[in-house]
């Protein structure tokens, strides 16, 4: 039995994280066969925490492959009958010790989960579970507390209406106080600790014990081939019980002696050295969360679980945070709804993963009369006067850039700006200098618009401005109407999507 890094997983890791001494605790949780780890359901069959935990101190360069484990057994008492099929959850917790750790600190190092099938009264079943880089070797068994007996810890109590009616020498039956305890059914003298019976007057031994009353420990010393060990001074006692005495084969396996040891012929559905391992098939539904079980048609073949989206683990028992992979593009909000992933897109983006930019030139164009310019795989907006920003949605001060040349005064206008030119200058931006002698402006003004004819010139400028203003206003109206239509379409789609999301979240 050990807890440590698995084989081929690089440098052995210390559980203490180089933070001084720590202790390991194990929490064992038993759930009925239908339990599903992902729902964090109660440990309905029982739970227990290991005790007498040795302190582990990390030494530089020391291998973490054999960590000191809690002494003794972790006993998980269960009520009522033993279900046979159950879920076993073993959590390895680290308690960081020492002042520099800021007082005791608890961390979950590893959690292993698996569905198991195990008859009560059988020998120890061995298991190895890997999770991440850790590997846990452990054994488990189920034992009945008297008066319950058999593979399912069925109660052998006589039904009575009240405890007061129990006959002489009989006590109320536990945990069924409305019944009475039955007389002993095992062979008289059968060890209550190391023996059990499924039929009256029999005494079957648990692993490690032998003899007619299961009171003799099986030795693993040099006396194995010469039978039972005697007192230290006398060596080994001969003869003694054979390897098959007390039948070490569980679950109905038949024992045969082979060169001083034994071999078990296991019935269908069981395997292992002592027939202690029960074969879980796909028909038992070992995969959680609707996972698909493949293989495992018979107990001798292993099964594999193919997990639904959002789940992982050998039995699909672990929920995956798929949003941690940041699947939503362009700043979209990720929602993991279990079997579906939804992205709530920011304004201007759409698609299952917010991958479509609605603001590209093919989609919703630049606002407020701006024109879209594409190039180099990107787009930008060339904004109309008075607007700025990525999409021309921000109002800009058209006079901020001092557009009027030669001391002209700038006046902000709803459609842009107007320059009032200083004497001697003309043009939309006061860019033309007018010669005082009435000669051509520099650069030349159009023929017929001489300074000598200021009224006609002013009328021309006003006419140009009016035409420009009308064109801009018309453009804005057209763009606003088309944008409203497009926005309404996307808002409708977004409302529908949010409704679906809300329904799925509620489901």
């Amino acid at each position: 039995h050990s807890f440590g890094p698995g084989p081929g997983l690089g440098t052995p890791r210390s559980p203490c994280n180089a933070r001084g001494p720590c202790r390991l605790f194990f929490r064992v949780c038993l759930k009925p066969g239908v339990s599903q780890e992902a729902t964090e359901s109660l440990c309905a069959l029982g739970a227990a925490l290991s005790t007498s935990v040795p302190v582990y101190t990390e030494h530089p360069g020391e291998s973490a492959a054999a960590l000191p484990l809690p002494d003794g057994l972790v006993r998980v008492p269960f009520r009522d009958a033993w279900p046979g099929t159950f879920s076993l959850v073993i959590e390895t917790w680290r308690e960081q010790l020492g002042e520099h750790a800021g007082g005791p600190a608890w961390n979950l190092l590893a959690r292993v989960v698996g569905r198991r099938r195990l008859a009560a009264g059988g020998p120890w079943a061995r298991d190895v579970q890997r999770t991440g880089t850790w590997e846990l070797h452990f054994s488990y068994r189920a034992r009945c507390e008297p008066p319950a007996v058999g593979a399912a810890c069925a109660r052998l109590c006589r039904s009575r209406s009240a405890p007061s009616r129990c006959g002489p020498g009989l006590r109320p039956c536990t945990p069924f106080p409305d019944e009475c305890e039955a007389p002993s059914v095992c062979r008289p003298g059968c060890s209550p600790e190391h023996g059990y019976c499924e039929e009256p007057d029999e005494c079957r031994c648990l692993e490690g014990w032998t003899g007619p009353l299961c009171t003799v420990p099986v030795s693993t010393s040099s006396c194995l081939n010469s039978r039972v060990p005697g007192p230290a001074s006398t060596g080994c006692l001969l003869p003694g019980p054979g390897p098959c005495d007390g039948n070490p084969c569980a679950n109905g396996g038949s024992c045969s002696e082979t060169s001083g040891s034994f071999e078990c012929a296991c019935p269908r559905g069981f395997y292992g050295l002592r027939c202690e391992v029960s074969g879980v098939t796909c028909a038992d539904g070992p995969c959680f969360n609707g996972g698909l079980c493949v293989g495992g048609e018979d107990p001798d073949s292993a099964y594999v679980c193919h997990c639904p989206p959002g789940f992982q683990g050998s039995n699909c028992e672990k929920r995956v945070d798929r949003c941690s992979l940041q699947p939503c593009q362009n700043g979209g909000l990720c929602l993991d709804l279990g079997h579906a992933l939804r992205c709530r897109c920011r304004a201007g983006f759409a698609g299952p993963r917010c991958e479509h930019d609605l603001d590209d030139c093919a989609g919703r164009a630049c606002a407020n009369g701006g024109t879209c310019v594409e190039g180099g795989g990107s787009r930008r907006c060339s904004c109309a006067l008075g607007f700025g920003g990525r999409d021309c949605r921000e109002r800009a001060d058209p006079c901020a850039s001092r557009p009027c040349a030669h001391g002209g005064r700038c006046y902000a206008h709803f459609s842009g700006l107007v320059c009032a030119c200083a004497p001697g200058y003309m043009g939309v931006r006061c860019e033309f200098a007018v010669r005082p002698d009435g000669a051509d402006a520099v650069p030349a003004a159009p023929r017929g618009l001489r300074q000598a004819d200021p009224q006609r010139f002013l009328a021309g400028v006003i006419a140009v401005i009016v035409v420009v203003v009308i064109a801009i206003v018309a453009g804005i109206v057209v763009l606003v109407i088309s944008r409203k239509k497009r926005m309404a379409k996307y808002e409708k789609a977004e409302i529908k999507e949010m409704g679906e999301m809300h329904r799925e979240l509620n489901a």
Epitope: G33, V34, Q36, A283, G291, C293, P309, G338, E504
Partner: antibody, heavy 117, light 107 residues
Framework: EVQLVESGGGLVKPGGSLRLSCAAS????????MNWVRQAPGKGLEWVGQ??????????HYAESVKGRFTISREDSKNTVYLQMNSLKTEDTAVYYC????????WGQGTTVTVSS | NIVLTQSPATLSLSPGERATLSCKAS??????VSWFQQKPGQSPRLLIY???NRYTGIPARFSGSGSGTDFTLTISSLEPEDFAVYYC?????????FGGGTKVEIK
Amino acid sequence: EVQLVESGGGLVKPGGSLRLSCAASGITFSNFWMNWVRQAPGKGLEWVGQIRLKSEDYATHYAESVKGRFTISREDSKNTVYLQMNSLKTEDTAVYYCTTGYYFDYWGQGTTVTVSS
Amino acid sequence: NIVLTQSPATLSLSPGERATLSCKASENVGTYVSWFQQKPGQSPRLLIYGASNRYTGIPARFSGSGSGTDFTLTISSLEPEDFAVYYCGQFYSFPSTFGGGTKVEIK
């Protein structure tokens, strides 16, 4: 051998009700999600609904087309899942199959429901 | 819901020939696609899961490929018992949806 056997189909008038049953054998029924999938005559497959495990409070999910009209329940002690169909419409006419898991690995032989006046 | 489009609707082939069935998804479904076989008067049967994995007991002549939006079921050499309707189904997004089916008939 795994077997799923549907029953309870028949002819019913629009607006009527029907209760389908699916009895499972050869599997540890209480460990399996159960689904109903239907197939209209000459058409493809359509998922109807699903019921999960006791540990998931027997959570149910339904297709939009049947939401509010159909109800799925299960009795683990009897290895049986049910589909209660109310306010039936002509478009509910189909062969109804029960299937297991998220991936529909085991299927029953189906039971025919005809909604006609 | 994700829409699956199968093509062709009907495939007329002779025993021993190779059959290639296509399934296109309306959006990315990763590899969460299964293929089902349905013979007349029978219930559907799972053939392929996870786009390319054969389910328990399915003969090696059936193979699946693809990821994202384009998927293919290939029957390398048609046996008489393979003439049936084949459906693809997506299991990426809940609820699961199916394609309209491809009928493989004897030429």
